[in-house]
């Protein structure tokens, strides 16, 4: 038998992480984003839960919206109308997807200090939102539209055709929120608030997933969803432009879809106003490497809206797909015509470019072996952008701002040397036309937001500091994070490595992989984290490693584009490969070396330990995808091509985790599935669990009950927590 | 503590004009965003139009640019112009700050629109 082992951190004051402390949320941080309402006003929902108004001038603030008026309808959330006359309280809020939920709202008038009554808007709601301009009401019910032209008015019904699981107006299906647009809403006002576009999806033809939900009634409820899986029918989209001032008088008009687009199956992919007449629609093929941006304007004359050939950008990937996980949108400048959009250059690395009339003549504003991430503000005078370029790490994100008034634009990096230790990682929240500008840094050092002048990037006020979490955390013994690249053949890996406190470089460990390594993802991030890996190598003495293999994002497509077409090789491949270095380095324990991953994690995890290498003694994979048959259209088609004999079939069935059945039985392996995954079905988890039996295979599992893809429930993620470091800690004969 | 005073109603015929004011006593900044409001007896109180510190305009819908709302920092001071004054237009007028504070609505400045 093998001595249990137990890591005792050194004599220290310090204690370390417990799974407790993991468990409670005790070293969570705070982060601030102003909810800009002017050029230099913003309002803020303050801990105890009043509505606080700020002027960054004259450095006032005052409550709007009383803890007690929103106590008085249980509200957590709120929306101020532009015209500041009436604010929505949010309440009841019920989850249904990834970013789904209804809800009640209440209209509450701050000029007279009541609720509006009268007219109360139906519950519950799916999407509520406020024109951008007065106090006009948008709202979707039963996935019908509706508008009220102030909030005390009676509704006007837009849309009829709405029915549950069929057709869904102004609000994305299942496939379209998760896959495409990101959002639980499907509807765009104007910037003068008098047009409303839209998206119709028809589902009518989608096959449907059906599971149980137990519940705690006699029989289980079942649930069904229009879920399009890799080659099946697809939803049926259109888009409609209404005039929200007359809205009876025409009805909503159909926005043509560019006739290359129409000619076989197709996705609507974004929806961009560009001014009060100009709508910008991007759409894409089903074979997700050619997206059209097509500009429309209205007609007066023929109450219509025209899309002239002239004003449709194709862009086309010949390596994979197009864009990133998503096609970038188009941030257009003042003249409304030209725009800046983030695609790949001729080296295949994605840039900023600027289009005047053709993607041909488009000119390249960035350019680099690094990859410009986002687009935040353009304004007549300076364009801010997010990328990875400061001193070539793909792991951190920094600001930059490009005068484009001058010739050549000139590039400051705005974020770089402002707290160069602490932070690395920034996303950043601008006021209408820039003037102010809120930095959010992620890490590495504890999060911190500050508020900025955004004519000369001073600092004006720190918002968040964290500094409770900063007091919290002097006691504890936290592990040493590094983050570096290791070189395999032609190949760069970065990764990053979490050390036991005390690490001693001539002792061994036990080694856990951390991995996701999903296309376009991106693991090893300049990024503060206290988690449950955080804990392991804090307490049990456990070394973390996160490899960004290829398929993952931000270094070029060579490196992204790799896994196009043969997903669950390479990924998988680079996993094997970083491991053999990391014993390499001297102090990693061979027999003790674990995997662990969810989602697309547990796919690789899945695969890594059925790699027949005798790398890895044990692993898990929680709600893992095991076959891409299974999984959405948008996302595996995306990477994977058709399931079709003359397409991509043969790699579709010899990428299955149930292929490998066979190489599992030298390894240990927990596998975890929530059985109300509405994303990755438990199905997954099934077949594993059924081509294991059929191997004799023996393995470990554990279903959590009526949990969906993200099992967060607290009892449940306690449980599956607490189970998985058991296995971990016998895996790696660590005492309890 | 700021104390919001408005003056300058009264009453005029159809198509006329007035020009309302509201003076801070007290600090304003001006950076704060101002507005002025309108009720009719029995009715809620609405936004007639709004201005920030930045100098953007909000005007109701109704407004249908016949009112113009200004300041004069050096004044601490708020107006609106009213032209083409209708008899729907009849209502007390009053100043406070965009979005309002409810301790800070003063007695209004009444306008009586009537031939």
């Known amino acids: 038998l093998r001595p249990s082992r137990v890591y005792k951190p050194e004599g220290n004051t310090k204690r370390a992480l417990t799974l407790k402390d993991i468990l409670n949320g005790t070293f969570s941080y705070k982060t601030y984003f102003p909810n800009w309402i002017s050029e230099q006003e913003y309002l803020h929902q303050s801990e105890d839960d009043n509505i606080v108004f700020y002027n960054i001038e004259t450095r006032e603030s005052y409550i709007i919206l009383s803890n007690s008026t929103m106590k008085s309808v249980n509200a957590t959330d709120y929306g101020l109308s532009p015209d500041r006359q009436f604010v929505y309280l949010e309440s009841d809020y019920s989850k249904l997807w990834r970013y789904s939920y209804t809800a009640t709202y209440y209209i509450y008038d701050l000029q007279n200090g009541e609720f509006v009554r009268g007219y109360e808007l139906p519950r519950p709601i799916q999407y509520l939102c406020w024109s951008p301009v007065g106090s006009k009401l948008a709202y979707v019910y039963q996935n019908n539209i509706y508008l009220k032209q102030r909030p005390g008015d009676p509704p006007f019904q837009i849309t009829y055709t709405g029915r549950e699981n069929r057709i869904f107006n102004g609000i994305p299906d299942w496939v379209y929120e998760e896959e495409m647009l990101a959002t639980k809403y499907a509807l765009w006002w104007s910037p003068d608030g008098k047009f409303l576009a839209y998206v119709e999806f028809n589902d009518s033809d989608i096959p449907i997933i059906a599971y149980s939900y137990y519940g705690d009634g006699q029989y289980p409820r079942t649930i069904n969803i229009p879920y399009p899986k890799a080659g099946a029918k697809n939803p049926v989209v259109r888009v409609f432009i209404v005039d929200t001032t007359y809205p009876h008088h025409v009805g909503p008009m159909e926005v043509p879809v560019p006739e290359m687009i129409a000619s076989s199956d197709y996705y609507f992919s974004w929806l961009t106003w560009v001014s009060s007449e100009r709508v910008c629609l991007q759409w894409l093929k089903r074979v997700q490497n050619v997206s059209v941006l097509s500009i429309c304007d209205f007609r007066e004359d023929w109450h219509a809206w025209e899309c002239p050939k002239n004003q449709e950008h194709v862009e086309e990937s010949r390596t994979g797909w197009a864009g990133g996980f998503f096609v970038s949108t188009p941030a257009f400048s003042q003249d409304a015509t030209s725009y800046y959009k983030i695609f790949s250059d001729k080296d295949g690395y994605k840039h900023i470019h600027y289009i005047k009339d053709t993607v041909e003549n488009a000119i390249q504003i960035t350019s680099g072996k690094w990859e410009a991430i986002y687009i935040f503000r353009v304004t007549q005078d300076s364009l801010f952008y997010s990328s990875n370029e400061f001193e070539g790490y793909p792991g951190r994100r920094n600001i930059y701002r490009i005068s484009i008034g001058n010739s050549p634009p000139s590039k400051k990096c705005v974020t770089c040397h402002l707290r160069k230790e602490r932070c690395q990682y920034y996303t950043a929240s601008f006021s209408y036309k820039a003037k102010y500008y809120a930095l959010v840094c992620y890490g590495p050092g504890l999060p911190i937001s500050t508020l900025h002048d955004g004519r000369t990037d001073q600092e004006i006020q720190v918002l968040e500091e964290n500094k409770e979490l900063e007091n919290s955390l002097r006691n504890i013994q936290l592990p040493k994070v590094e983050i570096k690249k290791l070189k395999d053949g032609g190949l760069t890996f970065w990764y990053k490595m979490i050390l036991p406190p005390q690490f001693d470089r001539s002792k061994k460990y036990p080694l856990l992989i951390q991995v996701y390594g999903g296309p376009c993802s991106q693991s090893v991030k300049s990024v503060f984290a206290v988690n449950w890996i955080t804990y392991l190598a804090s307490k049990e003495g456990i070394v973390i490693a996160l490899v960004d293999g290829r398929g993952t994002a931000f270094q070029g497509d060579k490196f992204l584009h790799a896994v196009y077409r043969k997903l669950g090789v390479y990924e998988v491949e680079d996993q094997l490969t970083a491991v053999r270095k990391f014993i390499e380095m001297g102090f990693i324990d061979e027999e003790r070396i674990a995997i662990w991953g969810w989602s697309y994690g547990g796919y690789v995890s899945s695969l890594a330990l059925a790699s027949g290498t005798g790398l890895f003694k044990c692993g898990i994979a929680v709600a893992p995808v095991s076959s891409w048959e299974y999984y959405a259209s948008i996302y595996s088609e995306r990477f994977m091509g058709l399931p079709t004999k003359d397409d991509n079939l043969e790699h579709y069935k010899n990428s299955t985790v149930m292929a490998r059945a066979e190489y599992f039985r030298n390894v240990d392996y927990l596998l975890i599935h929530g059985t109300a995954d509405d994303n990755v079905h438990f199905q997954n988890s099934a077949q594993i669990a059924k081509a294991l039996v059929n191997a004799q295979v023996d393995f470990q599992a554990m279903w959590y009950s009526d949990q969906n893809h993200g099992i967060s429930s607290g009892r449940s993620q306690n449980h599956l927590y607490t189970h998985m470091t058991h296995f971990l800690k016998q895996c790696f004969s660590l005492s309890d | 503590d700021v104390q919001l005073v408005e003056s300058g109603g009264g009453l005029v015929q159809p198509g006329g004009s007035l020009r309302l004011s509201c003076v801070a006593s007290g600090r304003l900044s001006s950076s704060n965003s101002m507005a002025w409001y309108r009720q009719v007896p029995g009715k809620r109180r609405e936004l007639v139009a709004g201005i920030t510190g930045g100098g953007e305009t909000n005007y109701a819908d109704f407004v249908g640019g016949r009112f113009t709302i200004s300041r004069d920092n050096a004044k601490n001071g708020l107006y609106l112009q009213l032209n083409g004054l209708k008899p729907e237009d009849t209502a007390a007028y009053y100043c406070?700050?965009?979005?309002?504070?409810?301790?800070?609505w003063g007695q209004g400045t009444q306008v009586t629109v009537s031939s």
């Open positions: 406070n700050f965009w979005p309002p504070l409810i301790n800070y």
